[in-house]
Interface confidence: low
């Protein structure tokens, strides 16, 4: 058990100490049909865009981090699918800093795409406030880009 010693800034709590988790939701054991994935992506796109726009308005002047890479697409499937297990920890991490209703909806949709017993990876987020803001912005930008990419590939393939 890690015990917290002394006062710490918020963010060191969750953002800098994410733990590995096997999701309690029963995720599908097989890949969803493209029509279902498309519905989920359609649901995620406005949520992601809104979250990104809100954050950009609130945090003007924050640059994108060149040290952060969200491995949001699987490399082992064609067309690429959203790597839900890699993305979920980041959204659990930025939950405290965003509209909880939007984040919950995103997590709910990502959970549907997750394979059963697929572990979520542990992440480390910068403790420095400015770097943390930059990290969050980068995650939101990369997630939006990933959704666009998956959406395009779904539209170009069979419906």
């Amino acid at each position: 058990m890690l015990s917290h010693t002394g006062p710490s800034r918020f963010a060191l709590f969750l953002l800098c100490s994410m733990e590995t988790l096997l999701s309690s939701h029963m995720a599908p054991t097989h890949q969803l049909p493209p029509s279902d994935v498309r519905k989920i992506i359609l649901e995620l796109q406005p949520l992601s865009r809104g979250l990104l726009e809100d954050y950009q308005k609130k945090e003007t002047g924050v640059p994108e981090s060149n040290r952060t890479l969200l491995l949001c697409l699987t490399s082992d499937s064609q067309p690429p699918r959203l790597n839900s297990s890699a993305i979920l920890p980041y959204f659990r991490a930025i939950r405290p800093l965003s509209d909880k209703n939007i984040i919950d909806k995103i997590i709910e949709q990502l959970d549907k795409l997750k394979f059963q017993h697929e572990p979520e990876t542990e992440i480390s987020v910068p403790a420095d406030t400015f770097e943390c803001k930059s990290f969050i912005l980068t995650i939101l930008q990369q997630f939006s880009a990933c959704l666009e990419s998956v959406f395009k590939s779904l539209n170009s393939g069979p419906q």
Epitope: M1, L2, S3, H4, G6, P7, S8, R9, F10, A11, F13, L14, S17, E19, T20, L21, S23, S24, H25, K58, E59, R95, P96, L97, K100, I103, T129, C132, K133, I136
Partner: antibody, heavy 118, light 111 residues
């Protein structure tokens, strides 16, 4: 419907020990951080402990650290608070609280009463 | 520790009027542009209930007559128009830094 039901509160002598339990239902327990908050007889609220959703991370204020231990059993949907070296100032109503996003406490149980007196 | 000072300690407001409760922090409780201040309502014999989270977000199911505002060190809970059922004690709480702390409470009485 989210439900948090505390149990284990009792009258205990100074220096004694007690274990509180909180049975959770109506939500995916293992997806949420959980806390214990107490309310003293003069109605002041005090944060007691917090545990992360998987149980790996625990947090306490200095006056509690080393005496109380927060833990959870996700398979049983249960939160615990093991209290030892109890003092009269630990007399309070103890609430089990669900954490939202780790910084907001959005659902509180009805509480269980702990009295430390000789 | 961050000290939260609520004022007034008690207030009596006529039905339909506005109740304003203040919570001042001994240091900033904002992070990444978000005020990590929350408001709870507690009625006699009941557990606290979340009203407002992160300074200004209305918790689901809470009437829109409740609103929160503020940033950094100064936060306010507004209730307008006040109704009979709003008679309760209101607490602010910060989660910017450990240990999490609460204000001393404000008891609202309806005239």
């Amino acid at each position: 419907e989210v439900q948090l039901v505390e149990s284990g509160g009792d009258l205990v002598k100074p220096g004694g020990s007690l274990k509180l339990s909180c049975a959770a239902s109506g939500f995916s327990f293992s997806n949420y951080g959980m806390s214990w908050v107490r309310q003293t007889p003069d109605k002041r609220l005090e944060w007691v402990a917090t545990i992360s959703y998987g149980g790996s991370y625990t947090y306490y204020p200095d006056n509690i650290k080393g005496r109380f231990t927060i833990s959870r059993d996700n398979a049983k949907n249960t939160l615990y608070l093991q209290m030892s070296s109890l003092k009269s100032e630990d007399t309070a109503m103890y609430y089990c609280v669900r954490g939202y996003g780790y910084d907001t406490m959005d659902y509180w149980g009805q509480g269980t009463s702990v009295t430390v007196s000789s | 520790d961050i000290l939260l000072t609520q004022s007034p300690a008690s207030l009596a407001v006529s039905l339909g009027q506005r109740a304003i409760i203040s919570c001042k922090a001994s240091q900033s409780v904002s992070f990444a542009g978000t005020g990590l201040m929350h408001w709870y309502q507690q009625k006699p014999g009941q557990q606290p209930k979340l009203l407002i989270y992160r300074a200004s977000n209305l918790e689901a199911g809470v009437p829109t007559r409740f609103s929160g505002s503020g940033s950094r060190t100064d936060f306010t809970l507004n209730i307008h128009p006040v109704e009979e059922e709003d008679a309760a004690t209101y607490f602010c709480q910060q989660s910017r830094e450990y240990p999490w702390t609460f204000g001393g409470g404000t008891k609202l009485e309806i005239k």
